[in-house]
């Protein structure tokens, strides 16, 4: 059966925005106006996880790319990537677990902790234009907070 | 309070159409699937579809598929649910219900209800 | 479509009993699982979602359980409110489906 999806932008509790840069990584930067088109859309998959209260697994795929972001382990240190996969076979209900992010949702604000790897999450740094990385701490200079709006399919 | 509230009830010719509306109000519109079910007398509960206001998004039960269209007004937070070609069969209880648009609650709050009687 | 059987279709039960129903699936249903209460002439009323979350202000003597395709909604001493029709339904897969519902009357 195929996978629930929903086209959607995150903006981090700055409000900024997450844009392409390079062909394999997202950085976070203020966009007005006009620039707002760079911003990445993401096709938000509600897939199988762990069973928990207040967390929602899902998978977050580039709209129309066939890559997803997932969490892996590199030089010992939980990394945030763009992993690209076969477009025939993604995505699935059964997504690998590195694709997995459990979605935690309190007042409109989002937090994406990593299933692989609990208590890491997607995380902006307070500076300008600087990459999208997994992060080990939360509430912290890092920001792990992001609100969510919808993009029409 | 979260509050979905249906049009009157409606008595239809075969052949026409009846448009059934569900007003939305408590909560945030876009965020929320509005689901459409229907319940013939004495019967079981039915889906017919469901569109998030937010994305425009719209998925329909293949069995009503060309008949029914399924809108939304973000302005007013209303839902619409259309069923044409109407036949006796469609007599039922019409109720629109909501859901979050990660589907996490399920269908947690419905309207009251609104009976379309379709009758030569 | 994913075929659904929900039993029994009827039962006979007295204030305090211990009631159980069941819903069996043709295929593995994830999380996506509610169960609702409708009396005559009401709007169903839902219990419990993902399988077995209670819905705030629903009594606990009420609980859901199950995985894969085998779900249960259980009332665990039956009190003279909880004579109703009770409905499960999946939201896993397109179209969702509604059990054909469980009368449970008084004896």
């Known amino acids: 059966a195929p996978v629930r999806s929903l086209n959607c932008t995150l903006r981090d509790s700055q409000q900024k925005s997450l844009v392409m840069s390079g062909p394999y990584e997202l950085k976070a930067l203020h966009l007005q106006g006009q620039d707002m088109e760079q911003q990445v859309v993401f096709s938000m998959s509600f897939v199988q996880g762990e069973e928990s209260n207040d967390k929602i697994p899902v998978a977050l795929g580039l709209k129309e790319k066939n890559l997803y972001l997932s969490c892996v382990l590199k030089d010992d240190k939980p990394t945030l990537q763009l992993e690209s996969v076969d477009p025939k076979n993604y995505p699935k209900k059964k997504m690998e677990k590195r694709f997995v992010f459990n979605k935690i949702e309190i007042n409109n604000k989002l937090e994406f902790e990593s299933a692989q790897f609990p208590n890491w999450y997607i995380s902006t740094s307070q500076a300008e234009n600087m990459p999208v990385f997994l992060g080990g701490t939360k509430g912290g200079q890092d920001i792990t907070d992001f609100t969510m709006q919808f993009v029409s399919s | 309070q979260v509050q979905l509230v249906q049009s009157g009830a409606e008595v239809k010719k075969p052949g026409s159409s009846v448009k059934v509306s569900c007003k939305a109000s408590?909560?945030?519109?876009?965020?929320?699937?509005i689901e459409w079910v229907r319940q013939a007398p004495g019967q079981g509960l039915e889906w017919m579809g469901e569109?998030?206001?937010?994305?425009?998004?719209?998925n329909y039960n293949e069995k009503f598929k060309g008949r029914v269209t399924i809108t939304a007004d973000k302005s007013t937070s209303t839902a619409y649910m259309e069923l044409s070609s109407l036949r006796s069969e469609d007599t039922a209880v019409y109720y629109c219900?909501?859901?979050?648009?990660?589907?996490?609650?399920?269908?947690?709050?419905w309207g009251q209800g609104t009976l379309v009687t379709v009758s030569s | 479509d994913i075929q659904m059987t929900q039993s029994p279709s009827s039962l006979s039960a007295s204030v305090g009993d211990r009631v159980t129903i069941t819903c069996k699936f043709s295929?593995?249903?994830?999380?996506?699982l509610s169960w609702f209460q409708q009396k005559p002439g009401k709007a169903p009323k839902s219990l419990i979602y993902?399988?077995?979350r209670l819905v705030d202000g629903v009594p606990s003597r009420f609980s859901g359980s199950g995985s894969g395709t085998d779900f249960t909604l259980t009332i665990s001493s039956l009190q003279p409110e909880d004579f109703a029709t009770y409905y499960c339904?999946?939201?896993?897969?397109?179209?969702?489906?509604f059990g054909g519902g469980t009368k449970v009357e008084i004896k």
């Open positions: 569109i998030l206001p937010g994305s425009g998004d719209i």
């Open positions: 408590g909560y945030t519109f876009d965020r929320y699937w």
């Open positions: 295929q593995d249903i994830d999380r996506f």
């Open positions: 339904v999946q939201y896993d897969e397109f179209p969702y489906t």
């Open positions: 219900a909501r859901m979050y648009y990660d589907y996490d609650q399920g269908f947690d709050y």
């Open positions: 993902r399988v077995k």
